[in-house]
Amino acid sequence: PGPPPGSPRASPDPRAELDSTVLLTRSLLEDTRQLTIQLKDKFPADGDHNLDSLPTLAMSAGALGALQLPSVLTRLRADLLSYLRHVQWLRRAMGSSLKTLEPELGTLQTRLDRLLRRLQLLMSRLALPQLPPDPPAPPLAPPSSTWGGIRAAHAILGGLHLTLDWAVRGLLLLKTRL
């Protein structure tokens, strides 16, 4: 091999990548907030709703300080994959009932997918463990009724909002350690 010519910068530095990941997460958080407002406006919720198949919230923002970069990114990726699956399920199962939210739900799914790819690239650039994907989860059962589906939508968007809020805080904190 000959003398080493320098290469141009091929792609963003991981720290710049983290900045754009934070921006994307923030914009997804805002999308989710707006969608939640629309959902509550069209289908008012009677109290809080939960769904057993959703991931439990990673942790309180206060406990973030003790976290390490690998565990934050790995956990965040796993949780967001689960939410992506739930959003896809919601769109399939509730197509007609949630038609009024459809363009926004589609955008949410696309951006969620983009964020997941960004996180994976970041983990790859940093050479952090890319864990084997969880065994395929059993398919989500269709909602028992239209109202059951709407309750599920409230639970999915509410959980995703909390997860993204945690993600923004976590990623900003991690930026200081990179």
Epitope: S11, D13, P14, A127, P129, Q130, P133, L178
Partner: antibody, heavy 114, light 111 residues
């Protein structure tokens, strides 16, 4: 400009040792994982070892496990590969790379022969 | 024997479109992990051509494109030029081997 410059290659007898170094410049080396990838004469690329940006995670190909050790010194912007118990089949050009890998050095030739 | 399977050779005439495939399994490409493509010109080090399945690093012409579906990925080169004659490698993380893996490489000849 991004540059990765390998050194330390050469001729060594079977069972011998070598330490490869890779000096990085032109980018924030400490924010990237570091790889060693090799290419035997006339063959394809074979991943050898990988270390995370901060040195906390290390991964090795089965063919070198227990014989090679990857390490890094971020204060010196340098990646290392300590190669022990070398075999004839380790003969190859060894490339240092960073990131996905996004950036590659030009390689250093390691020849294991008696 | 490489974990990712590529055809050993491919060819095309200038201006043509050529596609190189990369076949994997459920522990690498099929597990949702990214595929990257590298170009190695004769006598030089590999260069990143496509990352994250379809993203092009700055400086890579848009004649090069990548895609992924299921357990396979492919690299397409349109408007083939003589300077594209090189070896092309796909790579992905393998979760069962716990490390990156490369395809065996495809030698592209421009006729």
């Amino acid at each position: 400009e991004v540059q990765l410059l390998e050194s330390g290659g050469g001729l060594v007898q079977p069972g011998g040792s070598l330490r490869l170094s890779c000096a990085a410049s032109g980018f924030t080396f400490s924010s990237y994982g570091g790889h060693w990838v090799r290419q035997a004469p006339g063959k394809g690329l074979e991943w050898v070892a990988l270390i995370s940006y901060d040195g906390s995670y290390k991964y090795y190909a089965d063919s070198v496990k227990g014989r090679f050790t990857i390490s890094r010194d971020n204060s010196k912007n340098t990646l290392y590969l300590q190669m022990n118990s070398l075999r004839a089949e380790d003969t190859a050009v060894y490339y240092c790379a960073a990131g996905v890998p996004d950036y590659w050095g030009q390689g250093t030739l390691v020849t294991v022969s008696s | 024997q490489s974990v990712l399977t590529q055809p050993p050779s491919a060819s095309g005439t200038p201006g043509q479109r050529v596609t190189i495939s990369c076949s994997g399994s459920s522990s690498n490409i099929g597990s949702g992990l990214d595929v990257h493509w590298y170009q190695q010109l004769p006598g030089t080090a590999p260069k990143l051509l496509i990352y994250s399945n379809e993203e092009r690093p700055s400086g890579v012409p848009d004649r090069f494109s990548g895609s992924k579906s299921g357990t396979s990925a492919s690299l397409a080169i349109s408007g083939l030029r003589s300077e594209d004659e090189a070896d092309y490698y796909c790579a992905a993380w393998d979760s069962s081997l716990y490390g990156p893996v490369f395809g065996g490489g495809t030698k592209l000849t421009v006729l």
